[in-house]
Every structure is written in structure tokens, then in C-alpha cells.
């Protein structure tokens, strides 16, 4: 039994880091493998993660962490029974994938303006809370070419757009994702999408 693709890990910078790897053949990850992880600190404990299958030869493990600070560094040991298959380390702050925003809502009752709001996925005491920026994706269910991205570079989790920038009388969907420049993170997953029917009063033409 050998590791074909070494574990790569990302952290949500709150409580979970996710590590993925591939074995050289079909593997029952949960029965055959264990990933041990330990904070590099005099008084830390080793923790065991039981991996799940992620495709035939792929494995994924969700490492639970109390909290994360930028200096944290973890040792990782991948075991198959008594055999050490791989040894490495992981610094969560250098491999951050933020949590996806939630509760995306489209408010259509503001006159001729669409207000999109969502929730910051972090609590106020988390470092990322004040460092997230967002991308909002809006697309038409009827027209695949009607697909747009709005970059929200301010901290407030909301976006206002004129309803008239979208076509009237058709359904749209929106979703949002987050990233943090301070840690050069990857983008989060997209939030669940939300749907609304776009309608607005066309302005009277002046002759």
C-alpha cells in the first residue's frame, strides 16, 4: 500500500481543516488508514482522524481544531496499521479556504433596486470576520449567456444593483462566495443559490 498523491490540506481558519490524498489502488480509507495530527507545541496532544473514501483510491479527512492562530503548525502522520506511509506538516494560516457565506436573500421590495444580503460565515472574534470580501454571481435561468459577477470589495455583506440592469419578467438566481486577501486564501465554495423573479416598471419614454 502506497500513497500516490500526498495529502494536501486546507483550513477554514476556525475549527476544521480538510486533507485529501490518493492511494495507489482502491482503498477502504476508514478501515485501513489513520491520519494523526498534532499541534507543534510542548503541551499538545496527538489526535486521530478517521478518513472517508473520496472516489476509489481517494481519501479525505476532516481534522478538528479548537481554534487557529497564524503561528500554528501541525505535524501529520499517515498510518496504515503499524506502517507509516507518509509524514508531513501543515500550517493552517498558509492554506486557508474560507467558509461559504450563508443566508443569501434577495430583497425585491426596494423601489427598482435589488438588495442582496448574506451572512458572514465567521463569528466576530475570528480574524477573518473583518477581512472577507465577496463575489456575487447572478445568472438567468432562461439564458446561459446572461451570467455576471459582482465583486464586493467592502466589508458589508450586501450588494445593491438596479433591477433594470437585469432583464424584466424572467427568473434569476444568485450565489455568493468569499475570500480574504490578508491570508491569500482560495475562494470559498459558493453559497446555496437563491431564486427570484425580476420585474420592474419600465420608465415612460419621453417624445
Amino acid at each position: 500500500m502506497k500513497v500516490l498523491q500526498e495529502p494536501t490540506c486546507v483550513s477554514d481558519y476556525m475549527s476544521i481543516s480538510t486533507c485529501e490524498w490518493k492511494m495507489n489502488g482502491p482503498t477502504n480509507c476508514s478501515t485501513e488508514l489513520r491520519l494523526l495530527y498534532q499541534l507543534v507545541f510542548l503541551l499538545s496532544e496527538a489526535h486521530t482522524c478517521i478518513p472517508e473514501n473520496n472516489g476509489g483510491a481517494g481519501c479525505v479527512c476532516h481534522l478538528l481544531m479548537d481554534d487557529v492562530v497564524s503561528a500554528d503548525n501541525y505535524t501529520l502522520d499517515l498510518w496504515a496499521g503499524q506502517q507509516l506511509l507518509w509524514k508531513g506538516s501543515f500550517k493552517p494560516s498558509e492554506h486557508v479556504k474560507p467558509r461559504a457565506p450563508g443566508n443569501l436573500t434577495v430583497h425585491t421590495n426596494v423601489s427598482d433596486t435589488l438588495l442582496l444580503t448574506w451572512s458572514n460565515p465567521y463569528p466576530p472574534d475570528n480574524y477573518l470576520y473583518n477581512h472577507l470580501t465577496y463575489a456575487v454571481n447572478i445568472w438567468s435561468e432562461n439564458d446561459p449567456a446572461d451570467f455576471r459577477i459582482y465583486n464586493v470589495t467592502y466589508l458589508e455583506p450586501s450588494l445593491r444593483i438596479a433591477a433594470s440592469t437585469l432583464k424584466s419578467g424572467i427568473s434569476y438566481r444568485a450565489r455568493v462566495r468569499a475570500w480574504a486577501q490578508c491570508y491569500n486564501t482560495t475562494w470559498s465554495e459558493w453559497s446555496p443559490s437563491t431564486k427570484w423573479h425580476n420585474s420592474y416598471r419600465e420608465p415612460f419614454e419621453q417624445h
Epitope: L39, F41, L42, L43, S44, E45, A46, V69, A71
Partner: antibody
Framework: EVQLLESGGGLVQPGGSLRLSCAAS????????MSWVRQAPGKGLEWVSA????????YYADSVKGRFTISRDNSKNTLHLQMNSLRAEDTAVYYC??????????????WGQGTLVTVSS | QSVLTQPPSASGTPGQRVTISCSGS????????VSWYQQLPGTAPKLLIY???KRPSGVPDRFSGSKSGTSASLAISGLRSEDEADYYC???????????FGGGTKLTVL
């Protein structure tokens, strides 16, 4: 409310032994590293010993190494310090404290009221 | 001799602002966070400031902490008689693999 309550201090002769205990409540004891910090009369604070949340990792200051033994019973939410071959310079108030959890943000966030250990003939 | 250096004493009159310094090195304060502890006469130490400048709930905002390079300081504004106590700084030391304290500063409110 987090509470740490030390017991077991007293007067002991040089070369003697004493066992300190610290009863913890108000938090999940098994999630935290725990420490003993002492303060000699009129002096400053000294980190004496510590034990990781599960008991697998232990620290001793050079001044007590080989004489003191720290242990914990997570089922009873209790921390212990067995002190052997006591010397006059071990005379101090011994505090039980919660932490530290990691190096970069190391802190003792809760302290007990302390128990006085006097080593004298 | 303590690893972290504090002035042995400081004083001020009620309402005044006083500052207590804590000097270390790259292996402790330079690389790790600083905490401050208050020890009122005859009582156990209590956490006053952690992560250089954060206050635990219940600690008045008259107390503030800061860090620059290998030094840290504790500032107390609007000094009160009940602030008379010993104040200790503390930090992890990477070289010693140990938590180290300053020698303590006795604050007198005149």
C-alpha cells in the same frame, strides 16, 4: 463560572513530601492543558509544571525536575502535584492555573486561590 | 533574574495615566503574544490583558496593552486606589520552551 480550588499545602520538613490537588469546575477540564505556578514569599511568579489536556505531554522547570510529578484525573476534573525531596527554596504559594494551550498565544486565563507550602525544620 | 524585564516599581496619583514596560527578546515577546496579570495584595494573580492588547470580559477599558518589537507595555488611565497591586507580564519563550514572567512591578497609588 470557572473555578480552581487548590488543597494539600502545609508545613513539611526538608526532604519530606507533599501532594497538592486542584479541583476544577465550570469548564470542560479534559480540553485544557493545566499548570502549577508558584510564588515564593515576596517574590515573583515561576512556572513550575504543566500537563497537556490528555496527560501525554508534561513540562517541569529545571528547579523541580526529578523531584516533582504532575498528573491529572480527567474523570474527576482534578490536577495533582506530587512533591518529593522538598527543599527550603520550594517554600511558596502554589497556584493551579488553566493553560497554556499553544506557544504564540500562551496565557494562564484562570487561577486558583493558591495553597501555601512551607518547607522548614 | 527574570527573562522579561520590568521596573520594580511605578506610581501615580488618582486620575493619572501610568505605563509599565516589559522588555524581552526575539525568542519571547518578539515572536509571541504578551499577557499581563494583576495581583492585588493577598490574592491570586488575575488575567488582565492577553494577546498583547485584548481584555477579558469584566476588565475595565482603563487597562490597555500594546506591543512593539521585543517590548510590551501596560497602560492604566484614570488611576484609582484599587489599582494598587503587583503587575506581571508573561510570554512564551521559544528558546527555553517555557512560559516566562517578568519580575513584577509594584504600583503605588499616591
Amino acid at each position: 463560572e470557572v473555578q480552581l480550588l487548590e488543597s494539600g499545602g502545609g508545613l513539611v520538613q526538608p526532604g519530606g513530601s507533599l501532594r497538592l490537588s486542584c479541583a476544577a469546575s465550570g469548564f470542560t477540564f479534559s480540553d485544557y492543558a493545566m499548570s502549577w505556578v508558584r510564588q515564593a514569599p515576596g517574590k515573583g511568579l515561576e512556572w513550575v509544571s504543566a500537563i497537556s489536556s490528555g496527560g501525554s505531554s508534561i513540562y517541569y522547570a529545571d528547579s523541580v525536575k526529578g523531584r516533582f510529578t504532575i498528573s491529572r484525573d480527567n474523570s474527576k476534573n482534578t490536577l495533582h502535584l506530587q512533591m518529593n525531596s522538598l527543599r527550603a527554596e520550594d517554600t511558596a504559594v502554589y497556584y493551579c492555573a488553566r493553560g497554556p494551550q499553544r506557544s504564540a498565544t500562551a496565557v494562564f486565563d484562570y487561577w486558583g486561590q493558591g495553597t501555601l507550602v512551607t518547607v522548614s525544620s | 533574574q527574570s527573562v522579561l524585564t520590568q521596573p520594580p516599581s511605578a506610581s501615580g496619583t488618582p486620575g493619572q495615566r501610568v505605563t509599565i514596560s516589559c522588555s524581552g527578546s526575539s525568542s519571547n515577546i518578539g515572536n509571541n503574544n504578551v499577557s499581563w496579570y494583576q495581583q492585588l495584595p493577598g490574592t491570586a494573580p488575575k488575567l488582565l490583558i492577553y494577546a498583547n492588547s485584548k481584555r477579558p470580559s469584566g476588565v475595565p477599558d482603563r487597562f490597555s496593552g500594546s506591543k512593539s518589537g521585543t517590548s510590551a507595555s501596560l497602560a492604566i488611565s484614570g488611576l484609582r486606589s484599587e489599582d494598587e497591586a503587583d503587575y506581571y507580564c508573561g510570554s512564551w519563550d521559544d528558546s527555553l520552551s517555557a512560559y516566562v514572567f517578568g519580575g513584577g512591578t509594584k504600583l503605588t497609588v499616591l
